[in-house]
């Protein structure tokens, strides 16, 4: 029996009968055997073929065979109802080999011209299965020359049996309060040769409960407990299953925070599996009960592990830990069902006793001392000395526990001294200086420091002076002995201030003119004002209006008297303005150089002289009357004059105020 | 984590101010809870001077009140301490600290009122 | 205001005793106590606030319990590391007090 060709030859060639194309002899008996590689099939098909018709051919055949499988009986030239012929069939061998068994009996009727055939190895496309017939692969197949192979979706290993595909379905830790878990692919059939397993792992203090829902169905056995596939459920204390069937299993109530659960498949069977719903309990809180004037959030039926609640109070009412307080109250239940912390109280807010307000008191208006939410008390400034600046006294205790004006603000209102009060009435005409009474002058302040110098009180705590005044303590402030609240230059009995800083202005240059000769002294503390210590007011915009020309105006001081000392007791003088060219001109002349008078000074005093500042009151006011508002006002301060005061043609030069009213309200704001 | 650290001088003279200042951080000191200063005289005990609270309200120790302000300054996180006209009975280690559910204090700084 | 009054004002047990301090208010503080510890040239520490509740980091042997004015610090299994100062304090009303310390040692 000749031998096809073998792999790994070239797999094709021709088959003929005995003798072809001529007739074949009697008596005949061929075989080939034809081998393809692994993973490869053979196809042959005729391209002649005349052999004698028989009886499901007895007699002459060509018999195809796989295996043991007889794949075709073939003779005669066209197929009958009994008999075939291979006419344009291709015939493929069942794996890789093929035999082909040619036999003639001892006769023939007539001639027969036998066959020919052509064969070839090709691949076998293992991913085609007929219906019916289980699939190659679980999930993809793909083909290649001489072989196939499988794959897997993702979420999916191949098994080592290389077709199937097992679930990759361990690992999964739950650690929600409730969730569910199912079989893989639920609630379509679960894969094969799978072992999954899932964790519910809780804080400590829960426990799981486990509900298995919608359906049940993993493959089952009638006489054996769960064979095949099955889920177990596995607890520190105990193991529930395992499980299959088609019932729903009881559930379960774990009494454990951490559960494991085991589903395990064979090769076999088409089932959809299970589906849990999980949830899980804790020993319950005591129920909150809100504060007073509180409420508890959210409200729920019951409070377990790791459940809060917030406490909020009432609007006027605060959140206190006895007498701590607090923005936000969170308690939380922990596992021995016991809160985090104790309850807390919603106290009625309470804005405490009010500040004490200088140069001012405070009444209580809801009641003797109430200061809770909502109570109402006013503030007022000392009369007649002091005035209330910006609002109007009264404060609530608001919710955030301030007291709080009208206008919203938390600061305490302010008591501003009463500026320009003077008992001093004045007379309409100019007469000779005159020792001052008490309450005339109370705005002026003696300093020494070195030399005597005087200044005015501004607001209370601020003095206006003469830059020459006080040039040499400029960097010394607390040398200057600041005396007021006296008529006597040497009286024991005055109220004391001392200086925290000199401020005299950049303008001023020292022995060289007087142009800019004014300063301030800040006081380190504020002084108490009275009928003897009150401010001078500075000049409103309108105030030139009562310094013109011949407009009356008041010096004081305890300056040089005509008797050439130091007066003893507080004097004043009443003078006139002089008009500006009149007063540079009687400067132009020696010994003084030109432009010694300039725009920033004024003028005052009598052409007949007489009258007059002098030296040590260096630095005082000059004062005017403002006719509408019934205050005093600083016009001028004292600053330079003739070598002989009160001569005639001379006249007393004052440092203009007017014009440094921005000067002194930055110092002032800024410091 | 929540950091308190004291900070001012070591010496301070008879009659003058003690300033002290506690910085904050890991936590804002408008969020919550009241911020306090605590002193410990050397061998002795612990003292509670006064709090701020979140919402800038202060509250002081009777007898203190008169000499003490707390305040802060809520762009630094910080709260303040000032005790003026101080003695040497106020010579002690100064803590600041909040308490109650939030229990910080910083290490400690000691002030000497010596001349 | 409201003094707090410490027994015993130092004590001395053995590693492994169970160890009380006792805390007395002149009134009512409610459950608003708290207890610290302070070792030498260190800050106080809080072990316990309202009266019974732990911090969060101390060890289960510190407990705490009462409320009005009888209040108890315990430390069921006294370690070496306890040797400290012992501060009970009130925060029910303003001002805020301490006990006057307790000293524990090691025998």
């Known amino acids: 029996t000749p031998l096809g060709p073998k792999w790994p030859e070239p797999v094709f060639g021709r088959l003929a009968s005995p003798g072809f194309p001529g007739e074949y002899a009697n008596d005949q008996e061929r075989r080939w055997t034809l081998t393809a590689p692994p993973g490869y099939r053979l196809r042959l098909y005729f391209t002649h073929f005349d052999l004698e018709l028989s009886h499901l051919c007895e007699y002459d055949f060509v018999k195809l065979s796989s295996g043991a499988k007889v794949l075709a009986t073939l003779c005669g030239q066209e197929s009958t109802d009994t008999e075939r012929a291979p006419g344009k069939d291709t015939f493929y061998s069942l794996g890789s080999s093929l035999d082909i068994t040619f036999r003639s009996d001892y006769s023939n009727e007539k001639p027969f011209t036998g066959f020919e055939a052509f064969y070839a190895a090709e691949d076998i496309d293992e991913c085609q299965v007929a219906p019916g017939e289980a699939p190659t692969c679980d999930h993809h197949c793909h083909n290649h020359l001489g072989g196939f192979y499988c794959s897997c979706r993702a979420g999916y290993v191949l098994h080592r049996n290389k077709r199937t595909c097992s679930a990759l379905c361990s690992g999964q830790v739950f650690t929600q309060r409730s969730g569910e878990l199912s079989s893989p692919e639920y609630p379509r059939p679960y894969p094969k040769l799978s072992s999954c397993t899932y964790s519910i792992s809780l804080e400590e203090g829960f426990s799981v409960i486990l509900d298995f829902v919608e359906s049940f169905d993993v493959e089952t056995h009638p006489e054996t407990l769960c064979p095949y596939d099955f889920l177990k459920i596995q607890t520190d204390r105990e193991e529930h299953g395992p499980f299959c069937g088609k019932t729903l299993p009881h559930r379960i109530e774990t009494k454990s925070n951490t559960v494991t659960i085991t589903f395990v498949t064979d090769e076999s069977g088409d089932h959809t599996g299970w589906k849990i719903h999980y949830t899980s309990t804790a020993q319950p809180c005591p129920y909150p009960m809100a504060p007073p004037n509180g409420h508890v959030s959210p409200v729920q039926a019951k409070y377990i592990l790791k459940d809060s609640f917030s406490i909020f109070c009432e609007t006027g009412y605060e959140l206190l830990q006895g007498h701590l307080p607090l923005k936000s109250f969170t308690a939380v239940c922990q596992k021995d069902g016991s809160w985090d912390r104790p309850m807390p109280a919603c106290s009625i807010v309470d804005c405490g006793p009010p500040d004490d307000l200088p140069s001012g008191r405070v009444e209580y208006i809801t009641g003797p001392g109430v200061t809770t939410y909502k109570a109402v008390i006013q503030y007022s400034c000392e009369e007649t000395f002091y005035t209330m600046k910006v609002n109007d006294g009264k404060y609530v205790c608001e919710a955030d526990g301030f007291w709080t004006s009208s206008k919203g603000e938390k600061s305490l209102p302010v008591c501003e001294p009463v500026c320009g009060l003077s008992a001093r009435t004045t007379g309409g005409r100019i007469y000779g200086g005159q020792k001052a009474k008490p309450g005339d002058f109370p705005w002026q302040v003696l300093i020494l420091g070195g030399t005597t110098a005087a200044g005015a009180l501004l607001y209370d705590n601020w003095v206006l002076t003469a830059a020459h005044a006080v040039y040499e303590q400029k960097h010394d402030a607390s040398a200057l002995d600041i005396r007021m609240g006296t008529l006597k230059r040497l009286s024991p009995h005055y109220t004391q201030a001392w200086s925290e800083a000199v401020f005299i202005h950049e303008g001023y240059t020292h022995d060289a003119g007087f142009d800019n000769d004014i300063a301030l002294i800040k006081l380190n503390n504020k002084v108490v004002i009275n009928s003897n210590i009150t401010p001078i007011c500075l000049p409103r915009k309108e105030a030139e209006s009562f310094m013109r020309t011949d407009d009356i105006g008041t010096a004081s001081g305890w300056g040089l008297t005509q008797r050439g000392f130091l007066a003893r007791n507080l004097m004043y003088v009443d003078i006139p303005i002089v008009d500006h060219q009149k007063c540079t001109a009687a400067y132009e002349k020696p010994p003084y150089p030109r432009g010694s008078v300039t725009a920033n000074m004024l003028c005052a005093g009598l052409e007949s002289g007489g009258k007059d500042s002098c030296r040590g009151d260096s630095g005082g006011a000059l004062v005017f009357l403002d006719s509408e508002t019934e205050r005093w006002f600083v016009g001028g301060i004292v600053s330079w004059g003739s070598m002989n005061c009160g001569e005639a043609g001379q006249y007393g030069v004052y440092t203009k105020v007017i014009n440094y009213i921005p000067w002194i309200e930055n110092i002032i704001s800024d410091f | 984590e929540v950091q308190l650290q004291e900070s001012g001088p070591g010496l301070v003279k008879p009659s003058q101010t003690l300033s002290l200042t506690c910085t904050v951080s890991?936590?804002?000191?408008?969020?919550?809870?009241?911020w306090n200063w605590i002193r410990q005289p050397p061998g002795k005990g612990l003292e509670w001077i006064g709090y701020?609270?979140?919402?800038?309200?202060?509250s002081y120790n009777p007898s203190l009140k008169s000499r003490v302000t707390i305040s802060r300054d809520t762009s630094k996180n910080q709260f303040s301490l000032k005790l003026s006209s101080v003695t040497a009975a106020d010579t002690a280690v100064y803590y600041c600290?909040?308490?109650?559910?939030?229990?910080?204090w910083g290490q400690g700084t000691t002030v000497t009122v010596s001349s | 205001d409201i003094q707090m009054t410490q027994s015993p004002s130092s004590l001395s047990a053995s590693v492994g005793d169970r160890v009380t301090i006792t805390c007395k208010a002149s009134?009512?503080?409610?459950?608003?106590v708290a207890w610290y510890q302070q070792k030498p040239g260190k800050s106080p520490k809080a072990l316990i606030y309202?009266?019974?509740y732990r911090y969060s980091g101390v060890p289960s042997r510190f407990s705490g319990s009462g409320s009005g004015t009888d209040f108890t610090l315990t430390i069921s299994s006294l370690q070496p590391e306890d040797v400290a100062e012992y501060y009970c304090?009130?925060?029910?009303?303003?001002?805020?007090?301490f006990g006057q310390g307790t000293k524990l040692e090691i025998k």
């Open positions: 890991g936590y804002s000191i408008t969020s919550d809870y009241a």
């Open positions: 701020i609270s979140y919402s800038g309200r202060t």
């Open positions: 009134q009512n503080v409610d459950t608003n």
């Open positions: 309202s009266a019974s």
């Open positions: 600290a909040v308490l109650y559910a939030l229990d910080y």
């Open positions: 304090q009130q925060y029910n009303s303003n001002p805020l007090t």
